[in-house]
């Protein structure tokens, strides 16, 4: 077999914490290793001799969304044999090829999924908008934490809104889960939310939600 | 607008300990990175450690591991650093500092003097 | 840990002059390298973050550059109000460190 090829394009893929380490290229009679470092800086092996070029390692990296985590991606021959012990992984007492993924600290770098509009209340003039607070991977104390939790106040959302037949937006930032405004009876009302995190120098925002009508959610409710 | 407030000067003997609180106000500070950074006289600045008070793991230079210990209460929203083992080459003008994880410290306190003296 | 290496040490400018300030670090930070200023008896105050985003309230004569390993603060012309001792800081996670600063003085 020949010498294996390195990886190439390694790419973090990060939702609400859910975490896909990608690469190139497809492997050809060679696999693949993945080896992720902890806090006490030790090297993992997840993935083992794969031929995929993907791998999931949400559940190392939630275990401190704090930390700088850096991951390499090992080209390793398929007739060579093979011993890891869960430090390094040697090739006839060699380390094999391998390429080095950027940085990745969870709390930093992960992205925002898209908000969900969970429901409208109507008081009178004044309608209130929540949006769902939804569950994330990370745990405290064995309990999954909600996005608002984990971020805080930090976490905010843009509310643009419109009434339903006119096109003129408006818009406004709050950080909490609920939005109210006054609104004209009879009216029907469209809300887009997207999720933003203020102190975030870089994917700050979240892919916007669907638009949802107050009408709609009227016919849904069987009203 | 936030607000570091630190506590007062302290003056500590070689061998003892001491510890230095930061209450936050006008801000979210749960899920804000608090850090320490000293400055001994006529010296530059040195990152001791941080904390992101909802995940309550500190992390620490490698030089202060041992020493410090960095410990956050939410619902005081005041993060506390404690040196022990001091000796003289601990005074210093410690501050807290907050910042978003992976970010710049936009907030600090005023900075309390820790003066170790026999 | 990564250390940052800042040069000059010490730099003697005259007022309106362009200050230059270098900031080296040892391994790659990408973008996440921070600029303080401080004054005698003042805490240190933010002028520039993730490289090159100047902070609230900062005034246009500071920017800064650079990504990777190295870095660059500039002030195109000084000001009397400028002479102080400015640090780098790097936050590519933690254990976040500093520069050992370079002292801007009046010539």
């Known amino acids: 077999a020949g010498i294996p090829e390195k990886a190439f394009n390694l790419t973090w893929i990060s939702t609400d914490f859910k975490t896909i380490l990608e690469w190139q290229p497809k492997p050809t009679n060679y696999t693949y290793t993945v080896q992720i470092s902890d806090r006490s800086r030790n090297w993992k092996n997840k993935c083992f001799s794969t031929t995929d070029t993907e791998c999931d390692l949400t559940d190392e990296i939630v275990k401190d969304v704090t930390w700088a985590y850096e991951a390499k991606v090992l080209s390793v021959p398929r007739r060579n044999s093979v011993h890891g012990d869960g430090d390094q992984l040697v090739i006839h007492g060699e380390e094999p090829p391998f390429t080095n993924a950027p940085k990745f600290l969870p709390y930093r770098d992960t992205n925002l999924g898209q908000p969900v509009i969970q429901q409208f209340e109507q008081d009178g003039r004044k309608l209130n908008v929540v949006v769902k607070d939804s569950l994330t991977l990370v745990r405290k104390n064995g309990t999954f934490l909600t996005l608002r939790q984990v971020f805080g106040k930090d976490l905010g959302y843009i509310i643009t809104y419109r009434k339903g037949s006119s096109t003129g937006k408006k818009t406004n930032i709050t950080n909490t889960n609920e939005f109210s405004i006054d609104v004209e009876e009879g009216v029907s009302y469209c809300f887009f939310v997207q999720a933003m995190i203020f102190s975030r120098k870089t994917n700050q925002n979240s892919p916007g939600s669907s638009t949802v009508c107050t009408e709609q959610w009227k016919s849904f409710l069987g009203e | 607008q936030v607000q570091l407030v630190q506590s007062g000067a302290e003056v500590k003997k070689p061998g003892s300990s001491v510890k230095v609180s930061c209450k936050a106000s006008?801000?979210?500070?749960?899920?804000?990175?608090i850090s320490w950074v000293r400055q001994a006289p006529g010296q530059g600045l040195e990152w001791m450690g941080g904390i992101i008070p909802i995940f309550g793991t500190a992390n620490h230079a490698q030089k202060f591991q041992g020493r410090v210990t960095i410990t956050a209460d939410e619902s005081t929203s005041t993060a506390y650093m404690e040196l022990s083992s001091l000796r003289s080459e601990d005074t210093a003008v410690y501050y807290c500092a907050r910042g978003g994880i992976g970010a710049d410290l936009d907030y600090w306190g005023q900075g309390t003097l820790v003066t170790v003296s026999s | 840990e990564i250390v940052l290496t800042q040069s000059p040490a010490t730099l003697s400018l005259s007022p309106g002059e362009r200050a230059t300030l270098s900031c080296r670090a040892s391994?790659?930070?990408?973008?996440?390298l921070a600029w303080y200023q401080q004054k005698p008896g003042q805490a240190p105050r933010l002028l520039i973050y993730?490289?090159?985003n100047r902070a609230t309230g900062i005034p246009a004569r500071f920017s800064g550059s650079g990504s990777g390993t190295d870095f660059t603060l500039t002030i195109s012309s000084l000001e009397p109000e400028d002479f102080a001792v400015y640090y780098c800081q790097q936050s590519d996670g933690w254990p976040y460190t500093f520069g050992q600063g370079t002292k801007v003085e009046i010539k």
């Open positions: 391994q790659s930070v990408a973008k996440w």
């Open positions: 006008g801000g979210t500070f749960s899920s804000y990175a």
């Open positions: 993730y490289a090159s």
